[in-house]
């Protein structure tokens, strides 16, 4: 009789990524005996939950039960029934819910625990939901995407797993775009930091790495374009705002009241003398940029080099991987090429915002509005923060690759925080030895 | 091990308040939320509220206008605060824990106090 | 307020015996039901979650089922320790809600 294999021992996990636009449910899965082996997790499941993000809920908390069913209905559907029970479930909140917190912690608490008794309320081991911090995002992204690009192997591999994978063992750096904060996360060339608070020690799979991160809270894409308008309006002569950074022939009405709900445009509030504005665009990239670049204060920096608003920032170093809405709205773009130099970017954007709104609306036809409005910003943004803000040049333009997935796992640092949380990222390289069920000597 | 204890008296005059103290042991009320549940023969069992462990608190809509729940989280304790009391408000009154983070079902319970409401 | 409904107020078994004990929700609960033991003088013992899913330490005779608004809990070899109460719990919507009781007796 022929040897049958013995059914792998498959472990999950759930890591839900509330972010501030909208939150998604991520299953991951790995082989049990291979736990500590690096690039073993892979993703098998996203889940985008429908509707905004939970800091939107704060005067509708009854209605968050509602809003996880059906994604946490899917998780029942994908994870065998017999492995409910040991499969652990993290929320980690990001910068939507570090803004409500600063608004109100008693709001912010509410929200977090009604999040709580939803996600308990099924058979899974739930772990709990939190605020994580701007510096944990940018370190999880980071592991998850050199764990992902096998960069903790210390295996060489004769082949390389993904098209921009070099056959070293140097890490990839991280940039994180979302709705309301940014990160950067790289290994500096320089060990010693000019600014402890950036500086973060890990010791992984046997090899210490000393990382520079940092969160840009408020400057997340969404957050941005409010302050930008907010920043605008106070120079508009009348309720109506000329703006470069949206189509020609596009309008929009704009509540006073909403442009200064967030934080973030605190420092540009003032009274004005309507309650109301009207967007209409005029699709200039030129200004848009110009316009942008008054978002990031350089004229201040109690440091060798700072990015933007005194933050340090030591010389870039190595590759990018550029994620999330970095991705989004590149890949939307059609920019993700590796072959696409920064010039050639910029002159598309160029091209891009000056399209009349009746023609963009006709030429994408399937998407939102809402979203459609806004690429036109959101590219100019992008090249704004990276080559401004991160101080990346035309030359080093080619070391940013825009990343949506590695092996099927999108970038982001869902992946990374349920590695550190369920211990899967060994200090020490684990020993290859031929004993089962990983016993190690 | 895991364990509640309810303290509070065993008499209360209708129209008076009950003030009842659940201490824990074994798990922090930072962790977990913590249920109160009450007893008795005419009405069986009937969920009364919850603290969760942030603070926030939810109340059966029938006890809301006379109900409160407050924790110290340092000293581990659970605070039950009714006003208003009749005779139909005898029973035995328990804390429960949620079995997970903030579920709404319970893996272990307090032995319970009883709770008579007379004059 | 979402009614459980346990039909049998009382249920006579014998050691060795199976038996299975009911719940009916009067609106759809999904699978948010748990069960608890009573024993006389006793505080509940919680043995089920989300309608199947067993605590550690409780014996696997007991066994849970059901999803909308019919629920079972089967005892399997009942066991004289067995004499209890049970009592079926919708977690589906506040007010949370307990079922009536089925007192379990043994011959």
């Known amino acids: 009789t022929q040897n049958k294999a013995l059914p792998e021992n498959i472990k999950y996990g759930i890591v839900l990524d509330a972010g501030s636009s909208h939150t998604s449910l991520y299953i991951y899965k790995w082989p049990a005996e291979k736990e500590n082996d690096t690039g073993v997790v892979h993703q098998v499941e996203e889940c985008r939950v429908k509707g905004p993000g939970i800091s939107k809920y704060v005067q509708k908390v009854n209605e968050i039960g509602i809003y996880l069913t059906d994604c946490m209905e899917r998780a029942r559907e994908v994870i065998p029934r017999s492995q409910h029970q040991e499969t652990p479930v993290y929320l980690g909140a990001t910068a939507g819910m570090r803004l409500l917190r600063m608004e109100s912690e008693e709001l912010a608490d509410r929200v977090l625990d009604v999040v709580e008794r939803s996600l308990s309320n099924y058979p899974f081991d739930f772990q709990g939901a939190r605020i994580i911090t701007g510096q944990e995002e940018g370190a999880y992204g980071w592991i998850t995407i050199n764990y992902l690009l096998g960069k903790f192997s210390q295996k060489t591999r004769w082949f390389s797993i993904v098209p921009y994978e070099t056959n070293n063992q140097e890490t990839f750096g991280a940039l994180d775009l979302g709705g309301a904060s940014t990160q950067i996360t790289f290994v500096p060339q320089n060990q010693t930091t000019e600014s402890p608070d950036n500086a973060l020690q890990f010791r992984l799979y046997g090899k210490d790495y000393n990382v520079y991160t940092h969160s840009f809270l408020c400057y997340g894409k969404d957050q941005a374009l409010w302050q930008k308008l907010a920043k605008d309006i106070q120079v508009a002569s009348n309720e109506i705002l000329r703006d470069p950074c949206f189509h020609p022939g596009y309008k929009k009405v704009v509540n006073v009241s909403d442009l200064y709900k967030t934080p973030c445009t605190k420092r540009f509030e003032m009274t004005l003398p309507f309650q109301q504005f009207e967007i209409q665009g005029i699709g200039n990239y030129q200004q848009c940029h110009q316009s942008v670049l008054e978002l990031f204060n350089t004229s201040y920096c109690p440091y060798s080099q700072c990015a933007f608003n005194g933050i340090f920032l030591p010389p870039l170093q190595g590759d990018f991987g550029a994620f999330s809405a970095f991705y989004f709205v590149m890949n939307f773009l059609n920019l993700t090429s590796e072959k696409v130099s920064q010039e050639k970017v910029t002159e598309m954007m160029k091209k891009f915002c000056s399209q009349p709104w009746e023609e963009i609306k006709t030429s994408y036809a399937g998407v939102k509005e809402k979203y459609l409005s806004e690429y036109c910003f959101s590219g100019t943004y992008i090249l704004s923060l990276l080559l401004q803000g991160y101080h990346f040049t035309a030359d080093s333009w080619e070391h940013i690759h825009f990343i949506g997935k590695i092996q099927g796992s999108d970038a982001g640092w869902t992946l990374g925080y349920m590695l550190n949380l369920t211990n899967m990222i060994p200090a020490e390289q684990p020993l290859s030895t031929p004993l089962s069920h990983s016993t190690y000597v | 091990q895991v364990q509640l204890k309810e303290s509070g008296p065993s008499l209360v005059q209708p129209s008076q308040s009950l003030s009842i103290t659940c201490t824990v042991s074994g798990f922090s009320l930072t962790n977990y939320g913590v249920h109160w549940v009450r007893q008795s023969p005419g009405k069986g069992l009937e969920w009364l509220g919850v603290?969760?462990?942030?603070?926030?608190?939810d109340y059966n809509a029938a006890f809301m206008s006379r109900l409160s729940i407050t924790k110290d989280n340092s000293k581990s304790q659970v605070f039950f605060k009714m006003n208003s009391l009749q005779a139909d408000d005898t029973a035995i009154y328990y804390c429960?824990?949620?079995?997970?983070?903030?579920?709404?079902?319970?893996?272990?319970w307090g032995q319970g106090t009883t709770l008579t409401v007379s004059s | 307020d979402i009614v459980m409904t346990q039909s049998h107020k009382f249920m006579s078994t014998s050691v060795g015996d199976r038996v299975s004990v009911t719940c009916k929700a009067s609106q759809n609960v999904g699978t948010n039901v748990a069960w608890y033991q009573q024993k006389p003088g006793q505080s509940p013992k919680a043995l089920i979650y989300s309608a199947s899913y067993r605590y550690s330490g409780v014996p696997d005779r007991f066994t849970g089922s059901g999803s909308g608004t019919d629920f079972t809990l089967t005892i399997s070899n009942v066991q004289s320790e067995d004499l209890a109460e049970y009592f079926c719990q919708q977690y589906n919507s506040y007010p949370l809600t307990f079922g009536t009781g089925t007192k379990l007796e043994i011959k």
């Open positions: 603290i969760l462990r942030r603070g926030s608190t």
């Open positions: 429960a824990k949620t079995a997970v983070v903030a579920g709404d079902y319970f893996d272990y």
